[in-house]
Interface confidence: low
């Protein structure tokens, strides 16, 4: 089932795990292009960011909620 899911997703015009512009992304999401831009990275290096790949998996695929007692509805 997972293989089919990823196969389908990989045929999308834009890979959903490549960008931070989806409903499941958080303010802490940063795209790899931004991470690799040294001048940008220097100004924000004090902040912890997550990658769109991680957020795609943990927030869209796994649909993590804020806690076991706060079920999500992603």
């Amino acid at each position: 089932a997972w293989a089919t899911y990823y196969l389908f997703q990989s045929f999308q015009k834009e890979l959903p795990w490549a960008h931070c512009n989806h409903s499941w992304n958080t303010p802490h999401c940063m795209e790899d292009t931004m991470r690799k831009n040294k001048s940008v990275w220097i100004t924000i290096s004090s902040t912890n960011f997550t990658s769109p790949v991680i957020e795609f998996w943990e927030r869209n695929v796994l649909s993590l909620s804020p806690g076991i007692d706060h079920p999500g509805s992603l």
Partner: antibody
Framework: QVKLQQSGAELMKPGASVKISCKAT????????IEWVKQRPGHGLEWIGE????????NYNEKFKGKATFTADTSSNTAYMQLSSLTSEDSAVYYC?????????????WGQGTLVTVSA | DIQLTQSPTTMAASPGEKITITCSAS???????LHWYQQKPGFSPKLLIY???NLASGVPARFSGSGSGTSYSLTIGTMEAEDVATYYC?????????FGGGTKLEIK
């Protein structure tokens, strides 16, 4: 269950510094952002900033840069906020809260608040 | 910074009455990052609704939320005495996260 226990009320002199603690229990402390919020009577709620205990990473509201400093001790599951150069404007109730895993579902759990009074 | 403006600032309602509180954002935010809190006098804020319309654990079904873009609202289907509190909206869309000024709800 998740619980955030804050340190007790503080009466401070102008110019002094104060360090507030927030002890977390009932979840994996390192994986969730700890948020800090200020509340003054008639001023509503103000977000000061946040710290991710696992990495020590921080985000500050520009307004509180130089005023607040966040630290976290993962061995004791405790987050700290130090407020420096205190003035009467810093008299308020300060809350710690737990942010969502990897982002924002709102602040689902709150400490009981720490009252800081600055008076000569 | 994104400013959140709540209205009304204060209001009084009779038991059983339907209440609507609005929250207007200075710029568009994703509905995934708009939350509501309830704060009773002398207590910490409590998460009421997260991601615009999801009820937090233990929150009665008479509470509901809706909205998108710059306009959001919190509705209490039938006001009860225990709903006397101050209600705040909050955005987690961009740093710094901000709260609305609050709506103080009283009972007639």
């Amino acid at each position: 269950q998740v619980k955030l226990q804050q340190s007790g009320a503080e009466l401070m002199k102008p110019g002094a510094s104060v360090k507030i603690s927030c002890k977390a229990t009932g979840y994996t402390f390192s994986r969730y952002w700890i948020e800090w919020v200020k509340q003054r009577p008639g001023h509503g709620l103000e977000w000061i900033g946040e710290i991710l205990p696992g990495s020590g990473s921080t985000n500050y509201n520009e307004k509180f840069k130089g005023k607040a400093t966040f630290t976290a001790d993962t061995s004791s599951n405790t987050a700290y906020m130090q407020l420096s150069s205190l003035t009467s404007e810093d008299s308020a109730v300060y809350y710690c809260a737990r942010g969502g895993f990897l982002g924002h579902y709102g602040f689902a759990y709150w400490g009981q608040g720490t009252l800081v009074t600055v008076s000569a | 910074d994104i400013q959140l403006t709540q209205s009304p600032t204060t209001m009084a309602a009779s038991p059983g009455e339907k209440i609507t509180i609005t929250c207007s954002a200075s710029s568009s935010i994703s509905s995934n990052y708009l939350h509501w809190y309830q704060q009773k006098p002398g207590f910490s804020p409590k998460l009421l609704i997260y991601r615009t319309s999801n009820l937090a654990s233990g929150v009665p079904a008479r509470f509901s939320g809706s909205g998108s873009g710059t306009s959001y609202s919190l509705t209490i289907g039938t006001m009860e005495a225990e709903d006397v509190a101050t209600y705040y909206c909050q955005q987690g869309s961009s740093i710094p996260y901000t709260f609305g000024g609050g709506t103080k709800l009283e009972i007639k």
